[in-house]
Amino acid sequence: RKIPKVGHTFFQKPESCPPVPGGSMKLDIGIINENQRVSMSRNIESRSTSPWNYTVTWDPNRYPSEVVQAQCRNLGCINAQGKEDISMNSVPIQQETLVVRRKHQGCSVSFQLEKVLVTVGCTCVTPVIHHVQ
Amino acid sequence: RKIPKVGHTFFQKPESCPPVPGGSMKLDIGIINENQRVSMSRNIESRSTSPWNYTVTWDPNRYPSEVVQAQCRNLGCINAQGKEDISMNSVPIQQETLVVRRKHQGCSVSFQLEKVLVTVGCTCVTPVIHHVQ
């Protein structure tokens, strides 16, 4: 799903207040709900009728440093017999997410939000167009 | 997929530098790759064999203010005949994501990262255990 543009309001102070100095804001240390965890079933990526693999990208100047991307294994979907059914489509499910980019020059460290497109998994769908061969 | 705990390194300055004052950091205004967009197939939530609905939660003190959650419509999956097959499972695909929480007292505005669990869509899986009914 899409993250809307920031516009010019969310990160600004109210109009009656002095502007933010130097184009930066105060980011408090610590993460709210840091211990919240995904509780998905085991191995759904291989048990799915639209199975997928995971690739991990690593960047020490990004939080989280590890971003996991899914890739659908098949064009079609896997049927009850374990065979690929090409009358159906394996389709990626994508999500826009925020990460934090760390920028440092010597002892001057600042952070910036970055939007990242993550493929979270795949789902099996009916094709829209059944065209004449 | 899981966001690891922040620990005490990512948001800290190097040890040789003076510590961050008041437990806060500098967050630069603007978002890198802000114009990046999801390009998913049309209506996959209703075309999927594990279809889902969307619910929007809204919070003006969160960025993004709108967070969309998916809920699987079925317990089982939809077969080629459009009937539900309860020998299969519709399973949510979840993703941990970051949002920014705005906190203000008068003209003093600060921000904090918050971890949110988002259900992005659903996929159809084979149960591991086929138990006697």
Epitope: Q36, S39, S41, R42, I44 | W52, N53, T55, Q69, Q71, C72, R73, N74, L75, G76, E84, I86, S87, N89, S90, V91, P92, Q94, L117, T119, V125, P127, V128, I129, H130, H131, Q133
Partner: nanobody, 125 residues
Framework: EVQLVESGGRLVQAGGSLRLSCAAS????????MGWFRQAPGKEREFVAA????????AYTDFVRGRFTISRDDARNTVYLHMTSLKPEDTAVYYC??????????????????WGQGTQVTVSS
């Protein structure tokens, strides 16, 4: 973590009706399919009914189908079990549960991680 609290159980005459409620607090209620299970004295806990995350789909065990109805109200973070035409063999402690895993089909008890403390339903003849 999700906390579940059942209510609505009581003594009722055979043929009567009851509505059990299960109030959820904690993590997002809509993230979970929900189920009702029951346990009669000296018997194992057994599946009664389940409802999907969206509330669009329900499933029942054979011995309650047509008599019991499961529903959910996401605005109130509550799941209900409406029980009609009650029989003495429906006497049990009824438990509400949230499904967090998908290793079995919807009636597989081990897939339900969060449980309430139960509410007693007694049907007298």
């Amino acid at each position: 973590e999700v906390q579940l609290v059942e209510s609505g159980g009581r003594l009722v005459q055979a043929g009567g009706s009851l509505r059990l409620s299960c109030a959820a607090s904690g993590r997002t209620f809509t993230s979970y399919p929900m189920g009702w299970f029951r346990q009669a004295p000296g018997k194992e806990r057994e599946f009664v009914a389940a409802i999907s995350m969206s509330g669009d789909d329900t499933a029942y065990t054979d011995f309650v189908r047509g008599r019991f109805t499961i529903s959910r109200d996401d605005a109130r973070n509550t799941v209900y079990l409406h029980m009609t035409s009650l029989k003495p063999e429906d006497t049990a402690v009824y438990y509400c549960a949230a499904r967090t895993s998908y290793d079995g089909t919807y009636d597989y008890i081990d897939d339900y991680s969060y449980w309430g403390q139960g509410t007693q339903v007694t049907v007298s003849s």
